[in-house]
């Protein structure tokens, strides 16, 4: 018995906007019916929650008011859309998925997108 | 699925030691980094030590005072501790993270990465 797998991409590009969104996939030993993913960020030694969500299988992903993250679900695929970054927030992001329901519990971890976030030039002045 | 249950608190007179064991079953610790976490009374849940195939790594705390190992064929992780203060009164916890290529001896022990949460055992260093 082995840790549950989770797929995520390398390496992701933020937009000009500062949005970064990637696809957290998971090989579920079992039928679950609630799930939760988070988010982790991993730079400079240090790890932060950047955002989790429970959810029931077959409903959306929920996340707080206040939370940078959004995102969908289908299936054991998760689509997870990160905004607001900035060049300060490039960082490997870690997808964890644990199956908290029914039992027995299980827990996968991805192994990090890196998350590349360059913030856009400011517009020059122009004189028209 | 991993299964983990510790054993071994109690109460114990400063300067004293206790030796905690989280033992495995349903799997083999082999892919697992261990970890030993803590919380106190009041406050949040800290990491004590972690342990995965080749490395281990301590909070600053308990340095030179605690010792992390395992036994692959028990299937189970020890926490020997020696020279027991009252500030290390709490309730202890094992839980398991799946190895990564990403962690350092510095993120190994991060509990964010973690799952499979025992229980918890009450050790209590008190004259």
């Known amino acids: 018995c082995k840790a549950m797998h989770v797929a995520q991409p390398a390496v992701v590009l933020a937009s000009s906007r500062g949005i970064a969104s990637f696809v957290c996939e998971y090989a579920s030993p079992g039928k679950a019916t609630e799930v939760r993913v988070t988010v982790l960020r991993q730079a400079d030694s240090q790890v932060t929650e950047v955002c989790a969500a429970t959810y029931m299988m077959g409903n959306e992903l929920t996340f707080l008011d206040d939370s940078i993250c959004t995102g969908t679900s289908s299936g054991n695929q998760v689509n997870l859309t990160i905004q607001g970054l900035r060049a300060m927030d490039t960082g490997l992001y870690i997808c964890k998925v644990e199956l908290m329901y029914p039992p027995p519990y299980y827990l996968g971890i991805g192994n990090g997108t890196q998350i590349y976030v360059i913030d856009p030039e400011p517009c020059p002045d122009s004189d028209f | 699925e991993v299964q983990l249950v510790e054993s071994g608190g109690g109460l114990v007179q400063p300067g004293g030691s206790l030796r905690l064991s989280c033992a495995a079953s349903?799997?083999?610790?082999?892919?697992?980094?261990i970890g030993w976490f803590r919380q106190a009374p009041g406050k949040g849940r800290e990491t004590v030590s972690c342990?995965?195939?080749?490395?281990?790594s301590y909070a600053d705390s308990v340095k030179g005072r605690f010792t992390i190992s395992r036994d692959n064929s028990k299937n189970t992780v020890y926490l020997q501790m020696n020279s027991l203060r009252a500030e290390d009164t709490a309730v202890y916890y094992c839980a398991a993270s799946p190895d990564k290529p990403f962690y350092t001896d510095q993120t190994m022990c991060n509990k964010h990465y973690y799952g499979y949460w025992t229980q918890g055992t009450q050790v209590t260093v008190s004259s």
């Open positions: 342990i995965n195939r080749s490395r281990t």
């Open positions: 349903g799997s083999t610790l082999d892919p697992f980094v």
